[in-house]
């Protein structure tokens, strides 16, 4: 029986050209995490395997950094990075847990404008 839950950073926004950390955390289970896959819209970004360590997809090597922990850091963000990201936790003996994060990458001026008019 799968008792675990995935906690994520949820919906997040960041400025174009900046960086963002994607984080998921598996809790409420004693299952062993054997591998975590990070995916974006049917594309593999990176994999962290308990035995083999990190593998970053070649097409993302310049903009993706492993960590912190089992998380992933996206750098030099572009508006095209807006979208859904998934962390897929492969565990033993539970099976697979999936978390979802939605990232919105904003033009710098839009982000600044939005910050100026936040409701206190």
């Amino acid at each position: 029986m799968m008792t675990g839950t995935i906690e994520t950073t949820g919906n997040i926004s960041a400025e174009k050209g900046g960086s963002i950390i994607l984080q998921c955390h598996l809790s409420s289970t004693t299952a062993q995490v054997t591998q975590v896959n990070w995916e974006q819209q049917d594309q593999l970004l990176a994999i962290c395997n308990a035995d083999l360590g990190w593998h970053i997809s070649p097409s993302f090597k310049d903009r993706v950094a492993p960590g912190p922990g089992l998380g992933l850091t996206l750098q030099s963000l572009t508006v095209n990075d807006t979208g859904e990201y998934f962390c897929i936790y492969h565990t033993y003996p539970d099976g697979t847990y999936t978390g979802r994060i939605f990232l919105e990458v904003l033009e710098s001026s839009v982000a600044e404008h939005g910050a100026r008019f936040q409701i206190p």
């Epitope: 995916e39 594309q43 593999l44 395997n49 035995d51 083999l52």
Partner: antibody, heavy 118, light 107 residues
Framework: EVQLLESGGGLVQPGGSLRLSCAAS????????MHWVRQAPGKGLEWVAY????????YYADSVKGRFTISRDNSKNTLYLQMNSLRAEDTAVYYC???????????WGQGTLVTVSS | DIQMTQSPSSLSASVGDRVTITCRAS??????LNWYQQKPGKAPKLLIY???SLQSGVPSRFSGSGSGTDFTLTISSLQPEDFATYYC?????????FGGGTKVEIK
């Protein structure tokens, strides 16, 4: 350098048994899952069996389930395929392959030919 | 089981030609699609993994694209050493399944 070397193939009668071995070198064997894949003469590739690095997960193709057993000895860096109740349709070249991250098969052995015939 | 359908089953091309091979899965497999090259009497060799990632040491004239159910292997400029049989393979679920192969022959 990663190397996978199969052995144990040969001619066997229908109903007979064979044990294939795959000797691995050049990498940390127990960190990698492994597959057996076969290829009948003049035909395409067919997956046979999978074993995780610690042998905790094992899967078989329906065509060999109950007849073939995959195993590994991590102390000897060796993968095995015990084949029982062999049939003519098991005739093929058998390859072992390494599986990083459970997604792709990055290194393959040279293959060993199994011929099942009376 | 997930069925993998490759097309064409064979093709004739000349050195320098652009060659495209397609692979279709019977259900969505996300990016879990790999491409292999096999020459007669030899073991398969990994070319492309996870749909579009070029395996280390493989020439950049090979590229892969697609996701979901439809995938493509492209050889931008065919070289003499590229005449071989090419297979796609899904690793989305067991049993792992391969396409029937595409034999690339000299025209």
């Amino acid at each position: 350098e990663v190397q996978l070397l199969e052995s144990g193939g040969g001619l066997v009668q229908p109903g007979g048994s064979l044990r294939l071995s795959c000797a691995a070198s050049g990498f940390t064997f127990n960190s990698y899952a492994m597959h057996w894949v076969r290829q009948a003469p003049g035909k395409g590739l067919e997956w046979v069996a999978y074993i995780s690095g610690n042998a905790g997960s094992i899967y078989y193709a329906d065509s060999v389930k109950g007849r073939f057993t995959i195993s590994r000895d991590n102390s000897k860096n060796t993968l095995y395929l015990q084949m029982n109740s062999l049939r003519a349709e098991d005739t093929a070249v058998y390859y072992c392959a390494r599986v990083p991250y459970s997604v792709w098969l990055d290194y393959w052995g040279q293959g060993t030919l199994v011929t099942v015939s009376s | 089981d997930i069925q993998m359908t490759q097309s064409p089953s064979s093709l004739s091309a000349s050195v320098g030609d652009r060659v495209t091979i397609t692979c279709r899965a019977s259900q969505s497999i996300s990016y879990y699609l790999n491409w292999y090259q096999q020459k007669p009497g030899k073991a398969p060799k990994l070319l492309i993994y996870a749909a579009s990632s070029l395996q280390s040491g493989v020439p950049s004239r090979f590229s892969g694209s697609g996701s979901g159910t439809d995938f493509t292997l492209t050889i931008s400029s065919l070289q003499p050493e590229d005449f071989a049989t090419y297979y796609c393979q899904q690793s989305y679920s067991t049993p792992l399944t391969f396409g029937g192969g595409t034999k690339v022959e000299i025209k």
